[in-house]
Interface confidence: low
């Protein structure tokens, strides 16, 4: 069997949801000594980065300027050490946002409910779309989908205090082209026992864990600080 290196990890810096015309940054974390990293888009070669010095860098950043719907889709990366190529990374879905209209998000029976109550979010968007997405801030990978023409429902069922937090919705023109985000709606769920004066902590939106964490070898120790490698060809 043909020998391959372990697959790299591909991540989006800051977020995989990139406003149109803004720059997207994807990180490919491979291995020290990798001489070349390739970014693939929808199965085809999209960009190449060659770190210098390769033995002291375990990944690269790919900057994708002027985000638009043609650049939104599925990305993956591979790397090479000598003549040996790695397996392909997992796929990363890069989404362009701020396309066309802005939806309106509402919640019923209201933003303040008691644990156990049934709650439904409604996302309304004027522009033609068939899919709507509801995201809880800080959990942007946990996307709920619903279908409708101008408005979609997101029944949450009986809620618990775990549902507390801020929500936004998007209309999706295709899997990778989303509308502007709605204004956030904060859901407050009061419990029977716990201290309800403690407001839930809302992680910043988008997720903090989407950050690229590339490491640089400095002798025996690795510098775990964020490090922006601008590749030179």
């Amino acid at each position: 069997p043909k020998q391959t290196l372990p697959k790299p990890i591909i991540r989006a810096e800051s977020t995989y949801m990139v406003p149109k015309e803004k720059q997207a940054t994807l990180c490919c974390q491979g291995s020290y000594g990798a001489v070349e990293y390739q970014l693939h888009f929808e199965g085809s070669l999209f960009a190449v980065e060659r770190p210098k010095p390769p033995e002291r860098i375990n990944g690269v950043k790919f900057h994708i300027p002027d985000m638009n719907s043609r650049k939104a889709g599925r990305y993956s990366c591979i790397y090479r050490v000598g003549e040996l190529w790695s397996e392909r990374s997992d796929l990363l879905d890069l989404v362009v946002t701020e396309m066309y209209d802005t939806p309106t998000l509402s919640v019923h029976p209201g933003p303040e409910v008691t644990s156990g109550e049934k709650v439904t979010f409604y996302c309304r968007l004027d522009t033609a779309t068939s899919m709507f997405l509801l995201l809880k801030e800080g959990r942007s990978r946990d996307v709920q989908r619903s279908y409708g023409k101008v408005q979609a429902e997101f029944p949450m069922g009986p809620v618990t205090t775990a549902h507390r937090g801020s929500y936004r919705c998007f209309g999706s023109y295709n899997n990778y082209a989303w509308s502007f985000p709605s204004e956030p709606v904060k859901l407050l769920v009061t419990g029977d026992i716990e201290n309800t004066s403690l407001a839930p902590t809302d992680p910043t939106f988008p997720d903090s864990w989407d950050t690229c964490l590339l490491t640089r070898e400095t002798g025996l120790q690795k510098d775990l600080a964020l490090w922006d490698h601008t590749a030179q060809n």
Epitope: E98, Y100, D101, T102, D126, T127, A128, K149, P181, E183
Partner: antibody, heavy 116, light 107 residues
């Protein structure tokens, strides 16, 4: 009831700018996008662009991009359309229209005449 | 952009008769097609949304049909106040586009 009331007729010189207002009432202004459609004398309807008052997101017809600016003031429920570098062919009736999927409510129209 | 083509440009029909107006999109717009009526000196008025959905306050004699690229507005029995210009509109994708209009005149 929903009402869109536009500012009055304007006469402008070529090369100048015009700003037309559209005051909305009878509904929650931020819940619908507001668009501008124009109609030259004896001609059909032409979409210029729209705005989401929610956060100011805009979409423009490329034909007008760079010349048209659409804004909205949530505090007064008023949308504005400014068209710059006016030329004689911009002589038209300009309508604001609320969009709820379709253009379900329209302003009465503002006549803009461009003449030297 | 999606080009909307209406036919005929002018339609002459007698009051009490049936009028059929056509609209064709240059590519499929599903049922995201809206119809408007405009009388001289007035703003357009929404008649039908999403190809066939009726609008509150619009007489039942106005109906719409079609999906994809071909659409029809039917006025079952023309009243004198129905003589006007009718426009179809692509509501599917930006830029939003209108047909050039069909003028419905008294025969």
């Amino acid at each position: 009831q929903v009402q869109l009331v536009q500012s009055g007729a304007e006469v402008k010189k070529p090369g100048s700018s015009v700003k037309v207002s559209c005051k909305a009432s009878g509904y929650t202004f931020s819940e619908y996008t507001m668009h501008w459609v124009r109609q030259a004398p004896g001609q059909g309807l032409e979409w210029m662009g729209g705005i989401s008052p929610n956060i100011g997101g805009t979409s423009y017809n490329q034909k007008f991009k760079g010349r048209v600016t659409i804004t909205a003031d949530k505090s007064t429920s008023t949308a504005y359309m400014e068209l710059s570098s006016l030329r004689s062919e911009d002589t038209a009736v300009y309508y604001c229209a609320r969009r709820g999927g379709s253009f379900d409510y329209w302003g009465q129209g503002t006549t803009v005449t461009v003449s030297s | 952009e999606i080009v909307m083509t209406q036919s005929p440009a002018t339609l002459s029909v007698s009051p009490g008769e049936r009028a059929t107006l056509s609209c064709r999109a240059s590519q499929s717009i599903s049922d995201y097609l809206h119809w408007y009526q405009q009388k001289p000196g007035q703003a357009p008025r929404l008649l039908i949304k999403y190809a066939s959905q009726s609008i509150s306050g619009i007489p039942a004699r106005f109906s719409g049909s079609g999906s994809g690229t071909d659409f029809t507005l039917t006025i079952s029995s023309l009243e004198p106040e129905d003589f006007a210009v009718y426009y179809c509109q692509n509501g599917h994708s930006f830029p939003l586009t209108f047909g050039q209009g069909t003028k419905l005149e008294i025969k």
